[in-house]
């Protein structure tokens, strides 16, 4: 047993271009606080369930408030350390994410809104009982300064403290076979009571008899490595430290949602949904009462007076989940057709649909043509969600409102001249040639290419096209 | 973290055509859950929107009813941008010219992110 | 031109609140959502409200918006020196089938 000890340092703008905006501003004045995650061994995509080793939750910062115009400072921080207890042995390998979270200050319903600012992650070896290890991880543009460690708790000892100590029983030395506890040379080291032949370095046990083992070693002694040969199509990266990695469907195989939470893929990752008393990424923070404001975005907190009575969260229109913790997205189910906008109007859905569509999601064709009327004497014809007129001759537009040029197109063949007529128009054609728009060659015999030539029109007379 | 850049001349002559730009980075263009617009805004007249494009399984868009026989507005997937075109300007069309997002799921009219506008002036 | 109408200006003291109107018609307000913006001089307007009365992150809850029939009303309780500003609804108008927005109103804090 022992506590794993994290001392933010600072947090603040990285170096470099593009400094983030200040968190907090004068119209917004905000404070932050620290959540650390860790869990055993150097695999992230380990299947072990998420924040294995324990998670903590700082206390709040001071109230920080911009200075207008001033650059974005490193931000005021809680004060004290963030401690984690661990059960069982340190594992010696461990993984941590440290997040940093701002509270909005305000006066709505249900407490402060949170949001999270910045998230890091690492992976590291770590011996307990040694000094503070001090590291720097950036995210985006923010630069997040801590220092570390691991400690054992009376009466463990050790890198792993899986040694026991006990004070000593004469003044002088200690047992037959038994060492001084360093630091502490007035205690001596228990007995060991571990199964014969259980390795010092990789196993360790709490009872009489046992022998479990450290991260990456296997067998009944803890005295066997454990291999990755044997692992078939592994999903991510391994190493002899972490073992196999099981191939699975996705980021939800195992469930990595802790305290009975419920995974959901995304598109990106997975999404934990958590049952009461139970929130953070993973579900992995519990023990929450109203005092801790686990109620996001506004939520009202009833209950949970303390950690054995489960709170409340009585959500606002627009957001979901335990702790309301998700907005509703109806919207972005695309439920509107045809080009339809989606409005989410709290209380209910709306589709604004475009013209020529109706109905509840924009999924009916309107018959276009009606109450659409074509002025002089065009037709409407129906397509495509808007309606289109075809125009009588001489008329043109949208609506055939427009008086066409029936010559501009050039309609007379063979370089016969068109008149505009109030009916349409009239091609005169040039000698050789017949017919309404002068297409037909008149033979060198005199007879046509038609059968007959209209009565009373003779061939090169202009002909009028209706 | 959404940013739209404008580029585009700040002087056109009469009758002419004005043309701007508005970049996009920490979006798509072809994003079926928003909408791009583009709105003027000058003394006479205030807040003016113009028109706007987006795409729901294909392309659509919608003009105001004060400028449609001149403007086109065109989406360009390969450079993540979308632009205005105003043809036959007059010394009316002299604005500050701003493209927006409508970006909030649920609430397509809200523009939540805006450009950093264009003074555009119209003059011989 | 302005579709929405609202007071051309509205002042009051540090610590006081605020009350701006906008008023339109059944085709815009008495059937859409209504934003709300706010402008400095010289910069590009900043979404505040939207649909009636929801708040983007990072707006404080000085500010709520409200609508009631074809009229939409903006508040700002707590009156601070930087709310100084120009401030302007919208909505969807289902008649011009376009966005309108409202005259704007000049906010001076005294």
């Known amino acids: 047993a022992g506590v794993f000890e994290l001392q933010i340092h600072s947090f603040g703008p990285g170096p470099g271009p593009g400094a983030p905006r200040s968190p907090c501003s004068a119209r917004l004045p905000c404070r932050l606080f620290f959540r650390v995650c860790l869990k055993p061994g150097l695999s992230e995509e380990a299947a072990e369930s998420p924040c294995a080793l324990g998670a903590a939750l700082s206390a709040r910062g001071p109230v920080y408030t911009e200075q207008p115009g001033a650059p974005a400072p490193d931000l005021p921080l809680p004060d004290g350390l963030l401690q984690v207890p661990f059960r069982d042995a340190w594992p010696g390998t461990f993984s941590f994410i440290i997040e940093t979270w701002r509270e909005e200050l305000g006066d709505q319903i249900g407490g402060p809104a949170w949001s999270l600012l910045a998230r890091v992650a690492g992976r590291r070896r770590l011996a307990a009982g040694g000094p503070w290890a001090r590291d720097i991880q950036r995210a985006g543009a923010w630069e997040l300064r801590f220092s570390y460690r691991a400690r054992c708790e009376p009466p463990a000892v050790g890198t792993a403290c899986t040694r026991l100590c006990r004070p000593r029983s004469a003044p002088s030395r200690c047992g037959p076979g038994l060492r001084p506890c360093a630091p502490l040379e007035d205690e001596c080291e228990a007995p060991l009571v571990c199964r014969a032949g259980c390795s010092p370095e990789h196993g360790f046990c709490e009872q009489p008899g046992e022998c479990r083992c450290l991260e990456g070693w296997t067998g009944p002694l803890c005295t066997v490595p454990v291999s990755t040969s044997s692992c078939l199509s592994p999903r991510g990266p391994s190493s002899a430290t972490t073992g196999c990695l099981v191939p699975g469907p996705g980021p939800c195989d195992g469930n990595p949602c802790a305290n009975g939470g419920s995974c959901s893929e995304t598109p990106r990752s997975f999404e934990c949904t958590c049952p009461r008393g139970f929130y953070g990424l993973r579900c992995e923070v519990s023990g929450v009462t109203c005092a801790d404001g686990p109620c996001f975005n506004g939520g009202l907190c009833v209950g949970g007076a303390d950690p054995d009575s489960a709170y409340i969260c009585h959500c606002p229109p627009g957001f979901q989940g335990s702790n309301c913790e998700k907005r509703v997205d109806r919207c972005s189910l695309q439920p509107c057709r045809n080009g339809g906008l989606c409005l989410d109007l709290g209380h209910a859905l709306r589709c604004r649909c475009r013209a020529g569509f109706a109905g509840p999601r924009c999924e009916h064709d309107l018959d276009d043509c009606a109450g659409r009327a074509c002025a002089n004497g065009g037709t409407c014809v129906e397509g495509g969600g808007a309606h289109r007129c075809s125009c009588a001759l001489g008329f043109g537009g949208r609506d055939c409102r427009e008086r066409a040029d029936p010559c501009a197109a050039r309609p007379c063949a063979h370089g016969g001249r068109c008149y505009a007529h109030f009916s349409g128009l009239v091609c005169a054609c040039a000698p050789g040639y017949m017919g309404a728009r002068c297409e037909f060659p008149v033979h060198p015999d005199g007879a046509s290419a038609l059968p007959a030539a209209p009565p009373g029109l003779r061939p090169g007379d202009p002909q009028r096209y209706l | 973290q959404v940013q739209l850049q404008q580029s585009g001349p700040g002087l056109v002559k009469p009758s002419q055509t004005l043309s701007l730009t508005c970049a996009i980075s920490g979006d798509s263009v072809s994003s079926n859950s928003v909408v791009w617009n583009w709105i003027r805004q000058s003394p006479s007249r205030g807040l003016e929107w113009l028109g706007r494009?987006?795409?729901?399984?294909?392309?659509?868009?919608d003009y105001a009813v004060s400028v449609k026989s001149r403007i086109t507005i065109n989406p360009d997937t390969s450079k993540n941008q979308f632009s205005l075109q105003l043809n036959s300007v007059t010394p009316e069309d002299t604005a500050v010219y701003h493209c927006a997002r409508g970006g909030i799921v649920g609430a397509p009219d809200a523009f939540d992110i805006w450009g950093q506008g264009t003074m555009v002036t119209v003059s011989s | 031109q302005s579709v929405l109408t609202q007071p051309p200006s509205a002042s009051g003291t540090p610590g006081q609140r605020v009350t701006i109107s906008c008023s339109g018609s059944s085709s815009n307000i008495g059937s859409d959502p209504v934003s709300w913006y706010q402008q400095f001089p010289g910069t590009a307007p900043k979404l505040l409200i939207y649909t009636n009365n929801q708040r983007p992150s990072g707006v404080p809850d000085r500010f709520s918006g409200s609508k009631s029939g074809t009229s939409a009303s903006l508040a700002i309780s707590g009156l601070q020196s930087e709310d100084e500003a120009d401030y302007y609804c919208a909505a969807w108008d289902d008649s011009l089938n376009g966005h309108v927005f409202g005259t704007g109103t000049k906010v001076t804090v005294l």
């Open positions: 494009t987006y795409y729901r399984s294909k392309w659509y868009d």
